[in-house]
């Protein structure tokens, strides 16, 4: 497995009082049984609300690399291939669960963390506020 | 804490050979530091590729209930509010980490699992295959 510079303050896995702590098997089982799940694949280019993917890396987190979507335009692409500003490209955001090494650099001690990621973009009708 | 009918085969938290196992603090930390993350909120109704949320339940998983996006139409909604079948509504999928009790019914032993979920839909230009 991976060797991590060990923090001398790492908690003892056998400490009965280690707060709100459980054993987690990291031999990750992949339930994506569909042999061709056809993930968002090339949708980021073909969408009427296209997006770019940006790499976010953090070695103290699992997964350490998360790809974030950023919508390319404020508006959406119309049938002529132009940006239509009467519509809005917006990110679809989702909280995901990650593991963070805590204390830092401990090879076998983690904390669950929720982070908000943008998964892709969709085209929506804008909310128009009418001023009296 | 909670009383769970205990599986006699639960691994010993102190077993040095328990495979690829780490201590995880379940006090979930919220890293959503953005002051206005504006999650997907009402986009499922306002999108040109609207979606419904469908319930998927599994009592041995956390979260036990996962609401999955299913695109409402094969096509996309045009400016007149009609479905345009020259475009396609497609699901944006994301792999997420969930926790599974393993062995089942063990109160303090879990396994990380990756599952693919549809978090929303986007409108894409179809791939047209021309037959010679």
């Amino acid at each position: 497995g991976i060797t991590i510079p060990r923090n001398p303050g790492c908690p003892n896995s056998e400490d009965k009082n280690f707060p709100r702590t459980v054993m987690v098997n990291l031999n990750i089982h992949n339930r994506n049984t569909n042999t061709n799940p056809k993930r968002s694949s090339d949708y980021y280019n073909r969408s009427t609300s296209p997006w770019n993917l940006h790499r976010n890396e953090d070695p103290e987190r699992y997964p350490s690399v998360i790809w974030e979507a950023k919508c390319r335009h404020l508006g959406c692409i119309n049938a002529d291939g132009n940006v239509d500003y009467h519509m809005n490209s917006v990110p679809i955001q989702q909280e995901i669960l990650v593991l963070r090494r805590e204390p830092p650099h401990c090879p076998n001690s983690f904390r669950l963390e929720k982070i908000l990621v943008s998964v892709g973009c969709t085209c929506v009708t804008p909310i128009v506020h009418h001023v009296a | 804490g909670i009383t769970i009918p205990r599986n006699p085969g639960c691994p010993n938290s102190e077993d040095k050979n328990f495979p690829r196992t780490v201590m995880v603090n379940l006090n979930i930390h919220n890293r959503n530091t953005n002051t206005n993350p504006k999650r997907s909120s009402d986009y499922y109704n306002r999108s040109t590729s609207p979606w419904n949320l469908h319930r998927n339940e599994d009592p041995e998983r956390y979260p036990s209930v996962i609401w999955e996006a299913k695109c409402r139409h094969l096509g996309c909604i045009n400016a007149d509010g009609n479905v345009d079948y020259h475009m396609n509504s497609v699901p944006i999928q994301q792999e997420i980490l969930v926790l599974r009790r393993e062995p089942p019914h063990c109160p303090n032993s879990f396994r990380l699992e990756k599952i693919l979920v549809s978090v929303g839909c986007t409108c894409v230009t179809p791939i047209v295959h021309h037959v010679a």
């Epitope: 989702q94 | 993350p37 999650r39 997907s40 909120s41 339940e57 956390y62 979260p63 036990s64 926790l99």
Partner: antibody, heavy 126, light 107 residues
């Protein structure tokens, strides 16, 4: 349809303890949490604490820390709230509420209280 | 600890009138705010979740808006059965506390 049914009214003396039960039916008990909320006569709602059934994790409001114990039994799908060292200020209606913990619309685990028990009146009087 | 304040404390309203109740958080809570209705001698009932999401079985005259620190519950066309106390509740961070409530009665 989830239903939460609480135990009956209790009359206690100062210094005693009270244990209120909340029997859940419908839905997967291990999948959600149960929170306890109290309401003194003519007052607002006060969150006391809650349990995430899947992990058995309990959180308490600081005001009640050391005096309240929240537990749950998955085999009987019942949650319990025990409050010790009762005083007249603890006279209130005690409610259990379901905390869905669902992966929904951008949230990894939701925390709205979507179902409530009917309430248990606890009267503390000498 | 996040503190929620509501205004007004009390509102006396004529049927069919529009009612607006506001809830302010002492710090940013994203859209992690919920609204409950409590009628006399009844348990609270969830009306709106996550600031603006309607709840199944709740009449469409109830709507919510806002994010960050300022939130609004609107009742469009009050009906006699809407009399009761309305509470906001945050689930952004522990403890998951409630606002002090707004009592609505019918003139």
């Amino acid at each position: 349809e989830v239903q939460l049914v609480q135990s009956g009214a209790e009359v206690k003396k100062p210094g005693e303890s009270v244990k209120v039960s909340c029997k859940a039916s419908g839905g997967s008990f291990s999948g959600y949490g149960i929170s306890w909320v109290r309401q003194a006569p003519g007052q607002g709602l006060e969150w006391m604490g809650g349990i995430t059934n899947f992990f058995g994790i309990v959180d308490y409001a600081q005001k009640f820390q050391g005096r309240v114990t929240i537990t749950a039994d998955e085999s009987t799908t019942t949650a319990y709230m025990e409050l010790s060292g009762l005083t007249s200020d603890d006279t209130a209606v005690y409610y259990c509420a379901r905390d869905p913990n669902e992966f929904w619309n951008g949230y990894y685990a939701t925390h709205d209280f979507d179902y409530w028990g009917q309430g248990t009146t606890v009267t503390v009087s000498s | 600890e996040i503190v929620l304040t509501q205004s007004p404390d009390f509102q006396s309203v004529t049927p069919k009138e529009k009612v607006t109740i506001t809830c302010r958080a002492s710090q940013n809570i994203d859209s992690d705010l919920h609204w409950y209705q409590q009628k006399p001698d009844q348990s609270p009932k969830l009306l709106i979740k996550y600031a603006s999401h309607s709840v199944s079985g709740v009449p469409s005259r109830f709507s919510g808006s806002g994010s960050g620190t300022d939130f609004t519950l609107t009742i469009n066309g009050l009906e006699a059965e809407d009399a009761g106390t309305y509470y906001c509740h945050q689930s952004y961070s522990l403890p998951f506390n409630f606002g002090p409530g707004t009592k609505v009665d019918i003139k």
